[in-house]
């Protein structure tokens, strides 16, 4: 089934105009056409979209729960964002899977020079990694603090112990 | 208790809470608590979740309001992580599951995520963690050393 026909003729709440709007907005955020956006700019991007694809701010937690794949450098591919937003509107269904496959095939065929990418984490995993990193960092800073306090205490005792020898 | 949280943390918790408060009545069900916490990067076990619910859901009606949730999160953030919890945190970055993290990966994580360490702090950390200087950190030993009283 041709993607244009599939979206235009169906009674679904998403049409060709919505996808065009997505790509027009995308161009502003990715002027060099890399197909990727920095995770740090994702919140602004989805807030800038028009309904029904828009996710208005505050949206950071919502974007985490979308569990978007990320590649090295904390970048997210435009198709993964579009799929996730489409899924939010259409829900999880066989129709959604078919639409995703069609969109992916069309996209890859239309951009045959683009290198395929290997996601290494997701927005949900990244949030968990952030929390785990903080645990390690706090534990290490506590360790540094305790060590410097021990050293200070040792120096203090040492200087006072030695003061009676003169 | 909640006054120990930063404004940014409270805003994040509010967003997570609202996201799962489907009917907008200002409460979430105790069943949804795990989902909310996972969206905030926490990975509580079922037993931990039950302990938290028992602490805050005093009337046992199966719902938690935002102030209760905030109190619970503040309590969780305030608690000093146990040796096992810190080991679990390291395990997240041990992609091969072999008990080691490369010094380079550790440096990357510590300087790019969370409450970023300074270059000086991370240099010191790696000096302590990579004892034999082979570029690999046995984090089990490192955690023991860090948490030793």
């Amino acid at each position: 089934e041709n993607f244009n026909v599939a979206t235009e003729e169906s009674s679904e709440p998403l049409g060709e105009d919505d996808f065009e709007m997505f790509y027009e907005t995308w161009e502003k955020f990715d002027p060099d056409a890399t197909q990727f956006i920095a995770y740090s700019r994702l919140s602004d991007f989805v807030d800038t979209l028009q309904e029904p694809l828009r996710i208005a701010k505050p949206n950071k937690i919502k974007l985490i729960t979308l569990d978007l794949p990320m590649v090295p450098g904390d970048k997210i591919h435009c198709l993964d964002i579009l799929f996730a937003l489409t899924k939010e509107v259409l829900g999880d269904s066989g129709e959604m899977d078919a639409l995703k496959q069609t969109m992916e095939e069309k996209f890859m065929a239309a951009n045959p020079s683009k290198v395929s990418y290997e996601p290494i984490t997701t927005t949900l995993k990244r949030k968990h990694e952030e929390v785990c990193a903080i645990k390690i960092q706090r534990a290490y800073r506590r360790h540094l603090l305790q060590r410097s306090m021990k050293q200070a205490s040792y120096m203090y005792r040492h200087s006072h112990d030695g003061s009676g020898d003169d | 208790m909640a006054d120990q949280l930063t404004e940014e943390q409270i805003a994040e918790f509010k967003e997570a809470f609202s996201l799962f408060d489907k009917d907008g009545d200002g409460t979430i069900t105790t069943k949804e608590l795990g989902t909310v916490m996972r969206s905030l990067g926490q990975n509580p076990t079922e037993a931990e979740l039950q302990d938290m619910i028992n602490e805050v859901d005093a009337d046992g009606n199966g719902t938690i309001d935002f102030p209760e949730f905030l109190t619970m999160m503040a309590r969780k953030m305030k608690d000093t992580d146990s040796e096992e919890e810190i080991r679990e945190a390291f395990r997240v970055f041990d992609k091969d599951g072999n008990g080691y993290i490369s010094a380079a990966e550790l440096r990357h994580v510590m300087t790019n995520l969370g409450e970023k360490l300074t270059d000086e702090e991370v240099d010191e950390m790696i000096r302590e963690a990579d004892i034999d200087g082979d570029g690999q950190v046995n984090y089990e030993e490192f955690v023991q050393m860090m948490t030793a009283k």
Partner: nanobody, 124 residues
Framework: QVQLQESGGGLVQTGGSLRLSCKAS????????LAWSRQAPGKQREFVAS????????YYSGSVKGRFTVSRDNAKETVYLQMNDLKPEDSAVYYC?????????????????WGRGTQVTVSS
């Protein structure tokens, strides 16, 4: 600006072969992604094959995979479509299209440069 001119179409019997050519003129050919698309009477234009500027393998639509081969010759500024084992349902006007490889588009329909097409008729 890139101009594209298709040739090589014609009438052929079922099971026969044709080789279409698309000659480009204008900007640096080697920088362009190239695609073949076709449109049968009363139907929507459909993607056939595409080839990029990198070593990525070409893309083909399911209906032509294994029968059609797309290739390019940068020195001759030409892209080819070798069509074997032709079927009546392959009858259509075949179009060549191009875009700068550094530009991302959603679908082939968004390619900015198109030829005028060449007719392929497969008789049974």
């Amino acid at each position: 600006q890139v101009q594209l001119q298709e040739s090589g179409g014609g009438l052929v019997q079922t099971g026969g072969s044709l080789r279409l050519s698309c000659k480009a003129s204008g900007r640096a050919f080697a920088r362009y992604d190239l695609a073949w698309s076709r449109q049968a009477p009363g139907k929507q234009r459909e993607f056939v094959a595409s080839i990029g500027v990198t070593r990525n393998p070409p893309y083909y639509s399911g209906s032509v995979k294994g029968r059609f081969t797309v290739s390019r010759d940068n020195a001759k500024e030409t892209v080819y479509l070798q069509m074997n084992d032709l079927k009546p349902e392959d009858s259509a006007v075949y179009y060549c299209a191009a875009k700068d490889a550094s530009v991302t588009v959603a679908t082939i329909e968004d390619y900015p440069y198109w030829g005028r097409g060449t007719q392929v008729t497969v008789s049974s």
